[in-house]
């Protein structure tokens, strides 16, 4: 064990001295003393705190050749890149025998350029539309006064004077980049260069402007884009799912959107080749050399029903005295709608026509008027929706019946094109 | 601690260029603006002008075509000068860094034959 | 040049009063006005900075308010050291200018 020394009598013989610097810098504080006897470990505290994980190194130097000898202790702690937690107070602390003993303090200090807590960061923004920018700074030394600058030229007539760790720009009409200058008794540091690229505002009023059955035409409002001219709209529609639950403002649809884009101007785009009776959601951004602006929020939509685009298939008409039997198939044709319905129509060569709604049936039976003589009697089928009628099939001639014989399948079909009768009255 | 001391003639002629001196300790010129203000006795506040880190000036227009502000940054100082001065000159004249944490004590510039 | 005005030119008031000093601009600075206190024979002293912010040992009696173009600085309760005279500085825009000062005297 360590022999004691006497209590009024230190055995420091050197003690740390002062070290001030800058962040980052490297230093050493070192402390000598000599002892009598086995050389003890020597600690080193901060502001009165034993330094459990100091990068100390310790060095014994014996004075004579006896172990009883005196002893020349040297240790020396190591600072490396000096940081506002390295400051304060350090000494040496000692046990020796029964008591402990402390060196005179040294003193590490920071002080140097302003070093930046905070800097303004990129971002984009919408034109004319307020926003902050954020710079913080500090020493020591203190003060540090800060100074913004926006495209290089300052802000404030000088450091202090303006806004000083948040800007706050009312709205850019072009890409500008910001940067603050920091000040304080050392010197002057300039934060990073945050670019704030302006893009065009959001467009407003997305709405229709006409519906037909695969085709919406919609047109909106463009946002202010500052001195950049828009050079095309974006335009996105999804097929609405009830259990998607697209909100005003969700982000993104599940599926892929079906995605046009509209030479500007004029703010109207005619969004073709979509299912009729359909629902969907749209919405709009607008894009200059800049970038695109936001999306509008989802926009609910339909394409309203249309008429069913082919006759009704495989009719078949069979005559048996009075009576005529027809029946068909739906239409292989899209319906573009809810069908509510067929409409049929007979006519002899020198009878008038007859018309008939059958409703959602697909088959008739005929009372044929007279002794059912009349000759040339042929039968049309029309499929309906709510948007009107679908064309016509073409005339299918009545055949008598002769029992075991199938009966004929006629698959003939006028061009819908042309309509085959009119209906003022229906 | 930071320290500034203004140094000059007490007494110019009128005609004559008023020439003072800042120095300054505890703080680099070479950071923030230093700018010189005057008080003629018994009345309120001027701001004649300032320099900034960068060395250049910004000068109050009722004095700016005699007015100039240098600086020698080997020995931390800035300097005012005056030309054509009269009786209305007469003031007390502070160096100040122009947060204006800290001033000279003013030195009184009388302007006389 | 903007133009300050300072109201009133001087005020008589008792230790423990309030006082309000009002400095009026000849158009809107936007906070960038700060409020100095001065004794004679001595430099001016700041107070207030970006019209509402206390300088460093400033007591917390005085304060700033205002916006645009009406500022305010108030002590609450009037100390003994407190008489001086009070100067505004607008550093809007050069040239800098300051109010033509309040003295505030003892009652």
């Known amino acids: 064990a360590p022999r004691g020394t006497q209590a009024e009598e230190s055995p420091f013989v050197g003690n740390p001295g002062n070290i001030t610097g800058a962040r980052g810098l490297t230093g050493t504080l070192r402390c000598q003393l000599q002892v009598q006897g086995e050389p003890p470990e020597v600690h080193w505290l901060r502001d009165g705190q034993i330094l459990e994980l100091a990068d100390s190194t310790q060095t014994q130097v014996p004075l004579g050749e006896d172990e009883q000898d005196d002893w020349i202790v040297v240790s020396q702690l190591r600072i490396t890149s000096l940081q506002l937690s390295d400051t304060g107070q350090y000494q040496c602390l000692v046990f020796l025998g029964h008591q402990t003993f402390v060196s005179q303090p040294g003193y590490v200090g920071l002080e140097g350029l302003p070093y930046f807590l905070e800097e303004p960061e990129d971002r984009t923004v919408a034109a004319n539309t307020p926003f902050n920018l954020s710079c913080q700074a500090q020493g020591p030394p203190e003060p540090v006064d800060l100074l913004w600058l926006q495209d290089a030229v300052p802000l404030a007539t000088a450091p202090g004077h303006g806004p000083q760790r948040s800007l706050h720009v009312p709205g850019l009409n072009k890409t500008s980049s910001f940067s603050c200058e920091a000040h304080n008794a050392k010197g002057v540091t300039t934060s990073r260069t945050a670019t704030i690229t302006v893009l065009p505002q959001q467009p407003r009023n997305l709405h229709l402007v006409s519906r037909q059955p695969t085709e919406l035409e919609v047109a909106w409002t463009p946002g202010l884009s500052g001195i950049y001219p828009l050079t095309h709209c974006t335009l996105q529609a999804v097929l609405s799912d009830d259990g998607m639950g697209i909100q005003a403002g969700e982000p993104d649809p599940p599926e892929e959107p079906l995605t046009s884009q509209a030479s500007v101007p004029p703010h109207q785009l005619r969004l073709g080749s979509l299912h009729p009776h359909t629902p969907y959601h749209i919405r709009v951004a607008c894009t200059s050399s800049q970038g695109p602006s936001s999306w509008t929020h989802w926009l609910p939509v339909e394409t309203p029903e249309g008429v069913p685009l082919g006759p009704p298939e495989n009719i078949s008409a069979t005559r048996n005295g009075s009576q005529a039997f027809v029946h068909w198939q739906e239409p292989r044709a899209p319906l573009q709608g809810t069908l509510l319905g067929y409409r049929l129509a007979y006519q002899g060569q020198d009878t008038p026509e007859v018309l008939m709604d059958i409703g959602l049936r697909q088959e008739v039976t005929l009372e044929l008027q007279g002794d059912g003589s009349v000759s040339n009697l042929t039968v049309c089928v029309a499929a309906y929706t709510a948007a009107g009628d679908g064309p016509w099939s073409l005339p299918v001639p009545l055949e008598a019946w002769r029992p075991g014989e199938a009966q004929p399948v006629h698959q003939l079909v006028k061009e819908p094109s042309t309509p085959a009768f009119s209906w003022p009255w229906w | 601690q930071v320290q500034l001391q203004e140094s000059g003639p007490g007494l110019v002629k009128p005609s004559e260029t008023l020439s003072l001196t800042c120095t300054v300790s505890g703080y680099s010129i070479t950071s923030n603006y230093w700018g010189w203000i005057r008080q003629p006795p018994g009345k309120g506040l001027e701001w004649i002008g300032y320099i900034t880190y960068s060395g250049s000036t910004s000068y109050n227009p009722s004095l700016k075509s005699r007015v100039s502000i240098s600086r020698d940054t080997s020995k931390n100082q800035f300097s005012l000068k005056l030309s054509s001065v009269t009786a209305a000159d007469t003031a007390v004249y502070y160096c100040?860094?122009?947060?204006?944490?800290?001033w000279g004590q003013g030195t009184l510039v009388t302007v006389s034959s | 040049d903007i133009q300050m005005t300072q109201s009133p030119s001087s005020l008589s008031a008792s230790v423990g009063d309030r006082v309000t000093i009002t400095c009026r601009a000849s158009?809107?600075?936007?906070?960038?006005l700060r409020w100095y206190q001065q004794k004679p024979g001595k430099a001016p002293k700041l107070m207030i900075s970006?019209?509402?912010n206390l300088a460093a040992g400033v007591p917390s009696r005085f304060s700033g308010s205002g916006s645009g173009s009406d500022y305010t600085l108030t002590i609450s309760s009037l100390q003994p050291e407190d008489f001086a005279t009070y100067y505004c500085l607008q550093s809007k825009e050069s040239p800098w200018t300051f109010g033509q000062g309040t003295k505030v005297e003892i009652k």
């Open positions: 970006g019209a509402t």
């Open positions: 158009q809107d600075i936007g906070n960038y």
């Open positions: 100040a860094i122009t947060t204006f944490y800290y």
